[in-house]
């Protein structure tokens, strides 16, 4: 048993049929010695008397708020949550496996630049009675500070018969140098509580590996005289790290016809302009990627050819 | 990434082209190592991230873009221990910090070159003959060092009398390649920045 926060404790249980459970000793936080009784939740049934109460925790019915009283007055209380371990593996019932980039990916994180700011998100099909708390650090043995906000519900989607809820959190490394070479990864830890069930999820990454620039901005077309060619120009996204001559991007320019089956023409360039042939009803799209470290491409910025 | 490779203008900052080749070569070598050593801990998640230049050079600090010198977090350990001049320096305009920066890059390359050569000598003794260092990568390191043209004593190749542990050597190769790739990214950024300035 360990303390999650003031008066809230997590009991770790091996979860299998007829498991013996865990013996837990609760102590009433009071100088009183006599006349102390214990109850669970709203029930008036007395579970025991004395300054300590020993219980066998086996199932969710044994979790909840244990309260010690004296003469009708509440002295203290302890809320017990359960953390299930099945076949030696901690349960992951609360969050959905996103399976990207690999199986057992429950948390996904992205950064728009090298400032030390990043966003993580996760999915669940549970709509209520859910609490998340997020902590993060750089490294784990001698952790350096990363500050995370509160997790918020950022999207709701319907998937078949199920509704899916996306939660996200923004974190910022306390003292980040955009030019630094990372040798210790960022660790993100999410505590999830659904009713009286506790679970925890972790992710470890380098900012450089989760970079995904915003799409290029101000995408414009300039027709070239007496030609089907156009000059496409764009700019670095505002959110990208500066100076741009140090944090350089590379770009992919694509000409795509109306039908998905039509052949796509692609050009790669380090410049912020390119000359392409604009077909009728086609659209021109540009996306960006760090020029020197191949993390994710940005989403496409697009303009119609006409 | 299959990008069309642009050939630099002759008037262009001469080290930029070499640094681009360096990053390409080390990235290819790392990819080859990951594939060949698939049953070894060779991915970024599996290895310990060590920097053999730590406390010996200060490339990130010495080569910090002017715009980032206002950032307190970037100024933790600015050292000014390298004073020299080399052929990549753009004539008289070269600042003291730029000389320091390029000299630090040169020292990095020299240290990695020694490590890689020592390691290659060990790998050549492996009866499995599983992996060797790409000669192109070693040549590219050499070319960039020559372009930087700093005079410094040659460091003798480390030789060891004990029987090499090939498993450990291969893991160390992965660690070195990961670290060198990160440094090659920094070097490329620096050259791009200096070229633009």
């Amino acid at each position: 048993i360990w303390e999650l926060k003031k008066d809230v404790y997590v009991v770790e249980l091996d979860w299998y049929p007829d498991a013996p459970g865990e013996m837990v000793v609760l102590t009433c936080d009071t100088p009183e010695e006599d006349g102390i009784t214990w109850t669970l939740d709203q029930s008036s049934e007395v579970l025991g008397s004395g300054k300590t109460l020993t219980i066998q925790v086996k199932e969710f019915g044994d979790a909840g708020q244990y309260t010690c009283h004296k003469g009708g007055e509440v002295l203290s209380h302890s809320l017990l949550l359960l953390h299930k371990k099945e076949d030696g593996i901690w349960s992951t019932d609360i969050l959905k496996d996103q399976k990207e980039p690999k199986n057992k990916t429950f948390l996904r994180c992205e950064a728009k630049n090298y400032s030390g700011r990043f966003t993580c998100w996760w999915l669940t099909t549970i709509s209520t009675d859910l609490t998340f708390s997020v902590k993060s650090s750089r490294g784990s043995s001698d952790p350096q500070g990363v500050t995370c906000g509160a997790a918020t519900l950022s999207a709701e989607r319907v998937r078949g018969d199920n509704k899916e809820y996306e939660y996200s959190v923004e974190c910022q490394e306390d003292s980040a140098c955009p030019a630094a070479e990372e040798s210790l990864p960022i660790e993100v830890m999410v505590d999830a509580v659904h009713k009286l069930k506790y679970e925890n999820y972790t992710s470890s990454f380098f900012i450089r590996d989760i970079i995904k620039p915003d799409p290029p901005k101000n995408l414009q077309l300039k027709p070239l005289k007496n030609s089907r060619q156009v000059e496409v120009s764009w700019e670095y996204p505002d959110t990208w790290s500066t100076p741009h001559s140090y944090f350089s991007l590379t770009f992919c320019v694509q000409v795509q016809g109306k039908s998905k089956r039509e052949k796509k023409d692609r050009v790669f360039t380090d410049k912020t302009s390119a000359t392409v042939i604009c077909r009728k009803n086609a659209s021109i799209s540009v996306r960006a990627q760090d020029r020197y470290y191949s993390s994710s491409w940005s989403e496409w910025a697009s303009v119609p050819c006409s | 990434r299959n990008l069309p490779v642009a050939t630099p203008d002759p008037g262009m900052f001469p080290c930029l082209h070499h640094s681009q080749n360096l990053l390409r070569a080390v990235s290819n070598m790392l990819q080859k190592a990951r594939q060949t050593l698939e049953f070894y801990p060779c991915t970024s998640e599996e290895i310990d991230h060590e920097d053999i230049t730590k406390d010996k050079t200060s490339t990130v600090e010495a080569c910090l873009p002017l715009e980032l010198t206002k950032n307190e977090s970037c100024l933790n350990s600015r050292e000014t221990s390298f004073i020299t001049n080399g052929s990549c320096l753009a004539s008289r305009k070269t600042s003291f910090m730029m000389a320091l920066c390029l000299s630090s890059i040169y020292e990095d390359l020299k240290m990695y070159q020694v490590e890689f050569k020592t390691m290659n000598a060990k790998l050549l003794m492996d009866p499995k003959r599983q992996i060797f260092l790409d000669q192109n990568m070693l040549a590219v390191i050499d070319e960039l060092m020559q372009a930087l043209n700093f005079n410094s004593e040659t460091v003798p190749q480390k030789s060891s009398l004990e029987e090499p542990d090939f498993y450990k050597t291969k893991i160390k190769l992965c660690i070195l390649l990961h670290a060198f790739r990160i440094r090659a990214v920094t070097i490329d950024r620096v050259m791009s920045y200096l070229n633009a300035s």
């Epitope: 939740d41 909840g64 949550l81 209520t128 609490t131 009713k195 | -």
Partner: nanobody, 119 residues
């Protein structure tokens, strides 16, 4: 049978305070997030504040810093302390467990308690 009984409403001047209370019975109270909702005439019912099983609280932007939600798992009560009240806080206030509404698919709503903020 699930029962929710709200009390504590009344007429108060702008800037004044009220404390609402809700007694819940007929279900196991502790695991559920409990919420306070309000409905002004001609408007949709909105969630004002909630408190989870582990006492994490959430507030609508319009009441942040003025309202405080708390719970007592022994008595099965949830309270809403409302300070610096404004005329736009005028509404009928209800308490409920969002999870209970979701699970049972039934609308368990109490009679609510009227709060009127007027000079």
């Amino acid at each position: 049978e699930v029962q929710l009984v709200e009390s504590g409403g009344g007429l108060v001047h702008p800037g004044g305070s009220l404390r609402l209370s809700c007694v819940a019975s007929g279900f196991r109270f502790t695991p559920y997030t409990m919420g306070w909702y309000r409905q002004a005439p001609g408007k949709q019912r909105e969630l004002v504040a909630s408190i989870s099983s582990v006492y994490s609280t959430n507030y609508a932007d319009s009441v942040k810093g003025r309202f405080t939600v708390s719970r007592d798992n022994v008595k099965g009560t949830v309270s809403l302390q409302m300070n610096s009240l404004k005329p736009e806080d005028t509404a009928v206030y209800y308490c409920n467990a969002p999870g209970l509404l979701h699970e049972e698919g039934t609308d368990y709503w109490g009679q609510g308690t009227q709060v009127t903020v007027s000079s």
